[in-house]
Amino acid sequence: TIPPHVQKSVNNDMIVTDNNGAVKFPQLCKFCDVRFSTCDNQKSCMSNCSITSICEKPQEVCVAVWRKNDENITLETVCHDPKLPYHDFILEDAASPKCIMKEKKKPGETFFMCSCSSDECNDNIIFSEEYNTSNPDLLLVIFQ
C-alpha cells in the first residue's frame, strides 16, 4: 500500500496503484529511440540497444517500431503510455509479455510496431506468425 508519509496526490499528479492499492512500480524498457538496424527477413531480432531505462511513469509499457523504406531500416525502442497513441496508432497489445510485431499501414514504407509489459520485453522483437494471437492454434493453447 501507499506509505502513509508519501503524499497521495498533488496537482492532479496521482500516484499510480494496482488493484490491491499497492504502489505500481514502473517497468524497464530498452530505450534507444531511433537507431539504424540490420534486422530484416527474420522471425525475430534482438534490438541491439544497450540502454535499459526505468520508464518515467508506472503505467508506461515498452514499445518497438521497425521501419523499412528505400534507403534504410530503423528500429525505435521507447517507453510509452498505452492510453496515448504512438505514431498515430493505439497500442492494442500493451498487456502482452512479448513484443509481437504487427504491420501498420503507412504510405511509402513498411511499418511494424509492438508493445509489451514485461521488463526489457522490447529487446526481443518477434515477427514470426507462429507467435501471433490471430493464430487459432495459439488461441486454443491460451484458453485451455
Epitope: D18, A22, V23, F25, L28, I54
Partner: nanobody, 122 residues
Framework: EVQLLESGGGLVQPGGSLRLSCAAS???????QMWWVRQAPGKGLEFIS?????????YYANSVKGRFTISRDNSKNTLYLQMNSLRAEDTAVYYC???????????????WGQGTLVTVSS
C-alpha cells in the same frame, strides 16, 4: 519488522554532490530488489534507480542517468545513492524502497523508508 532508514540528505549547491544511505533491517537484505524513489514538492513519485539481487544489475531513469549511481553493501545491509552534478530539479524527498514478488503473478510486497530531504539551491 522490516525497517528502512534513509540518511545523508541536506542542502547542496547546484553542481554539488551528496551520498544518500539507506540502512535496512528485519529482512535478508542481500536477496532483495531495492529502489530509490523521489517525490519533488507538489509532484508524484519518480522512480529513479533500481538495483537487483543477485547480480547487482543497476538501472536508472533517463533524468538521472550519468549523474547518479546506485550501489549496495550487503555486508552492511545498506543501500547507497551517489548523486553528482546536482540540479535544482533534483530537489525532492528521497525514499528507498524494497520490492519482492508475492508469489502471485504480477503482484509485489513493497516497503518504504521515511525519506530524506535533498534541497539543491544556491
Amino acid at each position: 519488522e522490516v525497517q528502512l532508514l534513509e540518511s545523508g540528505g541536506g542542502l547542496v549547491q547546484p553542481g554539488g554532490s551528496l551520498r544518500l544511505s539507506c540502512a535496512a533491517s528485519g529482512f535478508t537484505f542481500g536477496t532483495e530488489q531495492m529502489w530509490w524513489v523521489r517525490q519533488a514538492p507538489g509532484k508524484g513519485l519518480e522512480f529513479i534507480s533500481r538495483i537487483d539481487s543477485p547480480g547487482g544489475r543497476t538501472y536508472y531513469a533517463n533524468s538521472v542517468k550519468g549523474r547518479f549511481t546506485i550501489s549496495r553493501d550487503n555486508s552492511k545491509n545498506t543501500l547507497y545513492l551517489q548523486m553528482n552534478s546536482l540540479r535544482a530539479e533534483d530537489t525532492a524527498v528521497y525514499y528507498c524502497a524494497k520490492r519482492r514478488p508475492t508469489g502471485v503473478s504480477g503482484t509485489f510486497y513493497d516497503y518504504w523508508g521515511q525519506g530524506t530531504l535533498v534541497t539543491v539551491s544556491s
